[in-house]
């Protein structure tokens, strides 16, 4: 039975040209996390596998950095980065848990909601 829950940074905003950390956290389960996928609806950004380490999709290599932890750092943000991001936790024995983050990339310094996850 799947008892865990995914906590995410929720809806966040950041400034164009800046950076943001996407974070998910799996709680309320003793299941072992064996892989985490970071995705958009139609493309894979990165995978962190317990045995194989991190893999960053070539199309994002220049702008995506692994971590901190199982999170993902997006750099040099553009307005086109606005949208939904998903963390998919592969666990044993529970199966998969998914969290959703909505990122809004703003043109000016209107970003405020996601400030504590923003990298200076």
């Amino acid at each position: 039975m799947m008892t865990g829950t995914i906590e995410t940074t929720g809806n966040i905003s950041a400034e164009k040209g800046g950076s943001i950390i996407l974070q998910c956290h799996l709680s309320s389960t003793t299941a072992q996390v064996t892989q985490v996928n970071w995705e958009q609806q139609d493309q894979l950004l990165a995978i962190c596998n317990a045995d194989l380490g991190w893999h960053i999709s070539p199309s994002f290599k220049d702008r995506v950095a692994p971590g901190p932890g199982l999170g993902l750092t997006l750099q040099s943000l553009t307005v086109n980065d606005t949208g939904e991001y998903f963390c998919i936790y592969h666990t044993y024995p529970d199966g998969t848990y998914t969290g959703r983050i909505f990122l809004e990339v703003l043109e000016s310094s209107v970003a405020e909601h996601g400030a504590r996850f923003q990298i200076p």
Epitope: Q35, N37, E39, Q41, D42, Q43, L44, I47, N49, L52, H55, S57, S59, F86, I88, H90, T96, T98
Partner: antibody, heavy 118, light 107 residues
Framework: QVQLQESGPGLVKPSQTLSLTCTVS?????????WNWIRQPPGKGLEWMGY???????MYNPSLKSRVTISRDTSKNQFSLKLSSVTAADTAVYYC???????????WGQGTLVTVSS | DIQMTQSPSSLSASVGDRVTITCKAS??????VAWYQQKPGKAPKLLIY???YRHTGVPSRFSGSGSGTDFTFTISSLQPEDFATYYC?????????FGQGTRLEIK
């Protein structure tokens, strides 16, 4: 549980437009996930055609992009496929399927055979 | 597009046999591969995702492994209901693409 059911004409004439509908029960197509069309010519492999997401965004296979349109009718909890300028090569079993975030397909309709012939 | 090349295209085996199918991707897809079983006149059924994770309710005799470009799907002890066609699929980038299939027949 979630069920998908394809419907539409089984025979389409060459150069015409193929139209199919997928009716989803047990889940609202506006709640989550991406809703896909995948086809399989007789005796051959599978080809992903495209999807419409729960938010209404679409993504198509570039090999078909100029001919394919996927839309939805949220009031009927249905999504549809239109494929224009069909030829005999478009004869296939057409499946609708729900995609999981990771790009795999856990839930499929039973498929419907569409034959393109005059 | 990423090409997925399966081998063999068909194979004969007996109940109780261990069977292995391989799939090679035309580029590195890390662990983003799924495996499906399809019986005649039926829709494909998801067995394995992310190279090695069994989908809900899939028996433990089915397993997957591999990363990068080379992937393996194994049935440890064939059961009568396992005779079918098996497909790999890359879930790394759109357009999502499938292998050409491996038809598993009774010897």
């Amino acid at each position: 549980q979630v069920q998908l059911q394809e419907s539409g004409p089984g025979l389409v004439k060459p150069s015409q437009t193929l139209s199919l509908t997928c009716t989803v029960s047990g889940y609202s197509i506006t709640d989550d996930y991406a809703w896909n069309w995948i086809r399989q010519p007789p005796g051959k492999g599978l080809e992903w055609m495209g999807y419409i997401s729960y938010s209404g965004n679409t993504m198509y296979n570039p090999s078909l992009k100029s001919r394919v349109t996927i839309s939805r009718d949220t009031s009927k909890n249905q999504f549809s496929l239109k494929l224009s300028s069909v030829t005999a090569a478009d004869t296939a079993v057409y499946y609708c399927a729900r995609k999981y975030y990771g790009g795999w397909f856990p839930i499929w309709g039973q498929g419907t055979l569409v034959t393109v012939s005059s | 597009d990423i090409q997925m090349t399966q081998s063999p295209s068909s194979l004969s085996a007996s109940v109780g046999d261990r069977v292995t199918i391989t799939c090679k991707a035309s580029q590195d897809v890390f662990t983003a591969v799924a495996w499906y079983q399809q019986k005649p006149g039926k829709a494909p059924k998801l067995l394995i995702y992310s190279a090695s994770y069994r989908h809900t309710g899939v028996p433990s005799r089915f397993s997957g492994s591999g990363s990068g470009t080379d992937f393996t799907f194994t049935i440890s002890s064939l059961q009568p209901e396992d005779f079918a066609t098996y497909y790999c699929q890359q879930s790394y980038s759109t357009p999502w693409t499938f292998g050409q299939g491996t038809r598993l027949e009774i010897k």
